[in-house]
């Protein structure tokens, strides 16, 4: 049967016994700069294309040893919650990835800078419909990586990221707090917000809305045909990615500015229990959680 | 995320170091009462001392970016100082990733051009 | 274009070994495995597993378990398949296919056993 | 792996619309997105028709469409012409591996 997470997002309309809009997001590219990925793991194949992009530090410690898997591991499953063939949000949708977190999950934010210069270039060069990107990613506040994100969001691009997993204010870190990127809080299954281990998601004025991101099934590069289920504001994020290249997909036109109005429209609203937030922050924290269009929009987003 | 926002530092460290009256030598002197600023995470565990993101003012060509780089690994030279240009930035953001010592964010800041520099920090999967 | 070569026909005796390679090319080799099918004389199609360009991970199907070796070699751009201690029921036509999604085919390699 | 049970087989006169079935489970056809159709000629390599239960191939024509409900999987052609006369496979995904129909020998009358 349908993910908790695909029923969620899914308008009443199309909650069958399974989640297919065949072509969704067919006429965008989603940029992810994670870990690397299993790019022809059954989920993905042929959906990803693997950029030539690296930029990541060592990893810590002397005793590190490197499981390819497990450097994958991340990047795989994200990109298989934007565009897996069986669990994936927007199924039709063409990805590339830029490696910038290490086997440890870790950059720098110099690294990602360069990857986002990468992209405006490739952008610039070959210049393609719509362009999402997807920062599964955080660091503390950072001037710079904000200024990076701001200039490639009036480039026209559209930036998804995650808002932290700190159990804090995302203005704190970064991209979470830069203004052009659309942030991403995770709840679960009971619209609460996420708890992991003694943190949990990130909330107040800098996120733009919440989606599912905990038990989330995607692509395991732990072999080719594996599933497993991981949470995070990561896997929040790559929801949101998804939704903003479907809509992206069915109107190509749309600004930045419009497809944020969208996506808050289309949210289910105060269905969060904000008790779950500092009491100055709740009604600094927006009580959406994200939703793919209904079905006046059917011949747009289901062709 | 969420548009309308002022800027939010939190409590980002800024710190502003200010420009010595004796100019180095330099062909281009800083314009006149603008004062470059240094930034890094606020968070102790996450800074990368010793890797610097200088930014420099938002219509600088490429050509003056490197410029800048090569004259800083210069004035670097003569002080003792080893200094490695990582990456020039062009195409979203004018500016280099330096490798060297923070011994010279004083002299680097006092560079045309010049806008901000940042200590590079770490980013973690979410 | 995509494209996928495969090596000539062999003939072979029981207890033998076979190896078909399969040469890739007009693709990111990486985004994808290749799955390699056979067809016995007037019979279907079966799957017999999948081999990685990306990392050379395999994943076979049961009934090949132990008999079958697939491998890669992304310097060449070549995959292979090996099967031994053949009896005359693998007589059949192998092919290669382009991952799971099996969207191009090999032209397919005539392996006949007999004694 | 059992394999997909499919009408061994299918005929039809120039012009007219067949439908092929093939009837799985709900551990591969009911369980995945991923239903393929392969057309092969005698002596020739099977050949894409339909991925991902309805989606065509760029160079396959329109006549042919794909649709699933529950555990049967369909490949409808309509329009049926000459060429069209080939065995014709089904294809589903499994949790671990791939699985074929029997094949279905479509006869153009």
């Known amino acids: 049967s349908i993910p908790w997470n695909l029923e969620r997002i899914t308008p009443p309309r199309y909650r069958a016994d399974e989640y297919q809009p065949p072509d969704g997001g067919s006429l965008v590219e989603v940029y992810l700069l994670d870990t690397s990925i299993q790019s022809d793991h059954r989920e993905i194949e042929g959906r990803v294309m693997v950029t030539d992009f690296e930029n990541v530090p060592e990893e810590d410690g002397t005793r590190f040893h490197r499981q390819a898997s497990k450097c994958d591991s991340h990047g795989t499953h994200l990109a298989g919650v934007v565009s897996g063939r069986d669990a994936g949000v927007a199924k039709g949708a063409s990805m590339r990835s830029l490696r910038v977190l290490n086997c440890q999950g870790k950059g720098t934010v110099s690294g990602t800078l360069i990857g986002l210069e990468f992209i405006r270039k490739s952008q610039l060069v070959q210049p393609v419909g719509p362009l999402v990107v997807l920062l599964p990613l955080a660091g503390g506040y950072s001037r710079v990586l904000n200024a990076a994100c701001q200039r490639l969001a009036r480039a026209g691009v559209v930036l998804v990221t995650a808002a932290g997993n700190f159990r804090d204010d995302a203005c704190l870190y970064s991209p979470a707090s830069a203004p052009e990127v659309i942030t991403v809080g995770a709840t679960n299954a009971q619209d609460q917000p996420v708890t992991l281990g003694t943190l949990g998601t990130n909330f107040g004025r800098c996120v733009d809305l919440f989606a599912p991101g905990e038990d989330i099934i995607g692509a395991s590069s732990d072999c080719s045909t594996c599933f497993v289920s991981q949470s995070g504001t990561s896997q929040a994020a790559a929801h949101v990615a998804g939704i903003a290249a479907m809509m992206l997909s069915a109107e190509p036109e749309l600004t930045l500015a419009e497809l944020r109005q969208r996506l808050i429209h289309f949210s289910a609203k105060d269905v969060i229990n904000e008790a779950w937030f500092p009491e100055d922050q709740r009604v600094l924290t927006p009580n959406l959680v994200a939703a793919l269009p209904p079905s006046t929009h059917e011949n747009l987003y289901f062709q | 995320g969420a548009m309308g926002q002022e800027d939010e530092d939190g409590d980002y460290e800024e710190l502003v170091l200010a420009l010595r009256s004796e100019e180095d030598g330099l062909a281009e002197a800083p314009e006149h009462g603008t004062t470059a600023t240094f930034h890094r995470c606020a968070k102790d565990p996450w800074r990368l001392p010793g890797t610097y993101v200088v930014v420099l003012k938002e219509e600088t060509h490429l050509s003056q970016s490197e410029r800048t780089a090569r004259r800083l690994q210069a004035q670097a030279a003569r002080r003792g100082y080893l200094t490695k240009i990582l990456h020039v930035f062009h195409g979203l953001l004018p500016g280099f990733l330096v490798k060297m010592s923070g011994d010279l964010l004083e002299l680097a800041l006092k560079l045309p051009h010049v806008d901000y520099i940042e200590e590079d920090s770490s980013v973690f999967a979410q | 274009q995509v494209q996928l070569v495969q090596s000539g026909a062999e003939v072979k005796k029981p207890g033998a070994s076979v190896k078909v390679s399969c040469k890739a090319s007009g693709y990111t080799l990486t985004s994808y495995g290749i799955s390699w099918v056979r067809q016995a004389p007037g019979q279907g199609l079966e799957w017999m597993g999948w081999?990685?360009?990306?990392?050379?991970?395999?994943n076979y199907a049961q009934k090949l378990q132990g008999r079958g070796t697939m491998t890669t070699d992304p310097s060449t751009s070549t995959a292979y398949m090996e099967l031994r201690s053949l009896r005359s029921d693998d007589t059949a036509v192998y092919y290669c296919?382009?991952?799971?999604?099996?969207?191009?085919w090999g032209q397919g390699t005539t392996v006949t056993v007999s004694s | 792996q059992s394999a997909l049970t499919q009408p061994a087989s299918v005929s039809g006169s120039p012009g007219q619309s067949i439908t092929i079935s093939c009837t799985g489970t709900?551990?591969?056809?009911?369980?995945?997105?991923?239903v393929s159709w392969y057309q092969q000629h005698p002596g020739k390599a099977p050949k894409l028709m339909i991925y991902?239960?309805?989606n065509r191939p760029s160079g396959v024509f329109n006549r042919f469409s794909g649709s699933k409900s529950g555990n049967t999987a369909s490949l409808t052609i309509s329009g049926l012409q000459a060429e069209d006369e080939a065995d014709y496979y089904c294809n589903s995904y499994t949790s671990t591996s791939m699985v074929f129909g029997g094949g279905t020998k479509l006869t153009v009358l």
């Open positions: 296919a382009r991952g799971y999604g099996m969207d191009v």
């Open positions: 709900s551990s591969d056809v009911g369980g995945y997105n991923s």
């Open positions: 991902e239960v309805s």
């Open positions: 081999v990685s360009f990306y990392n050379g991970n395999t």
